[in-house]
């Protein structure tokens, strides 16, 4: 999906209002500095691409992030403010439903959510403070 035509201001508002709080709750007891940055993004569409990938694509040691509250709200936000986004996600959602539920917060998941927080922070800053 090409995130170029999303309403970035609305997505930012949703992030600040709800998604950020859910991410921080997930990370509670863990400092973001416990994990080095292993993923970055270079503009707002790119940030959303990487956020979508980390949030919804299961990885070997962290398969269940898509069921978390922040993930559900991220999905709803993207569906609301990115034209045509929800249509592209139907197949992915059906595939996700077939997976077994496993409610374990592994260190790998904490690391992944730490990276997500970093990506969202980059998304909400409109520009580097100077240059």
């Amino acid at each position: 999906y090409d995130f170029t035509n999303c309403d970035f201001q609305k997505i930012e508002a949703d992030y600040l209002r709800t998604i950020s709080k859910d991410l921080i709750t997930y990370m509670s007891g863990t400092k973001s500095t416990d994990f080095n940055n292993t993923v970055s993004c270079s503009n707002r569409p790119h940030c959303l691409t990487e956020i979508q990938s980390l949030t919804f694509n299961p990885t070997p040691r962290c398969a269940s992030l898509a069921k978390e509250m922040f993930a559900r709200k991220t999905k709803a936000t993207l569906a609301l403010w990115c034209p045509g986004y929800s249509e592209t996600q139907i197949n992915a959602t059906q595939a996700m439903k077939k997976r077994r539920k496993r409610k374990v917060t592994t260190n790998k998941c904490l690391e992944q959510v730490s990276q997500l927080l970093g990506l969202w922070r980059r998304f909400i800053r409109t520009l580097l403070k100077k240059q």
């Epitope: 080095n36 292993t38 970055s40 503009n43 580097l128 240059q131």
Partner: antibody
């Protein structure tokens, strides 16, 4: 852990070519801008070139423009520097480094390789 | 092209504060990054975006930037701080990375 490992250095005669490589691991390579920086013996750091996170664009120091080419292969997590028409003044340790990028601005270089030595001598 | 000027050397007594400067035209309008390099080793980022510090760098390292001068401050200097220090900026007008000439810090 996050790592950059350079290879390909060696001794080469003036006017000849050499290709350096940098293997990245432990981070999502395709999301970072990548640089080459060199350091001549006993001298300071000299920036050589940078390539965008997606390979879309490149920038070069005037001292290497037209002779060196920076490329990346995001499918293999590798960065390359093709060095042609080498001169004695290109003798240096060559480091690769990563930096986050925002639009067309490159930020700090937060991870560096250990360097590979290139000696240009007849 | 853009030029960054650093003093070739700075000395500090153990436990005292070292200040290393980096000068450039209207430097305060750019984000300055600082690197530490010990002999035979690769550079290490110690301060980025003027005053931010990577999680692995001690709080003794701090930075500031305004006008035409950026400053790296190392408080409570230790023997292990002996190294070369380089400032760096991205020059948007020319799409080039610029390094200062480097400053050798000696802990007396």
């Amino acid at each position: 852990q996050m790592q950059l490992v350079e290879s390909g250095g060696g001794v080469v005669q003036p006017g000849r070519s050499l290709r350096l490589s940098c293997a990245a691991s432990g981070f999502t390579f395709r999301t970072y801008g990548m640089h080459w920086v060199r350091q001549a013996p006993g001298k300071g750091l000299e920036w050589v070139a940078v390539v965008w996170y997606d390979g879309y664009d490149t920038h070069y120091a005037d001292s290497v423009k037209g002779r060196f080419t920076i490329t990346r292969d995001n499918s293999k997590n590798t960065l390359n520097l093709q060095m042609n028409s080498l001169r004695a003044e290109d003798t240096a340790v060559y480091y690769c480094s990563r930096s986050p990028q925002w639009e067309d601005i490159f930020e700090s270089m937060d991870i560096w390789g250990q360097g590979t030595m290139v000696t240009v001598s007849s | 092209s853009y030029v960054l000027t650093q003093p070739p050397s700075v000395s500090v007594a153990p436990g005292q504060t070292a200040r290393i400067t980096c000068g450039g035209n209207n430097l305060g309008s750019k984000s300055v990054h600082w690197y530490q390099q010990k002999p035979g080793q690769a550079p290490v980022l110690v301060v980025y975006d003027d005053s931010d510090r990577p999680s692995w760098i001690p709080e003794r390292f701090s930075g500031s930037n305004s006008g035409n001068t950026a400053t790296l401050t190392i408080s409570r200097g230790e023997a292990g701080d002996e190294a070369d220090y380089y400032c760096q900026v991205w020059d948007m007008s020319s799409d080039l990375v610029v390094f200062g000439g480097g400053t050798k810090l000696t802990v007396l």
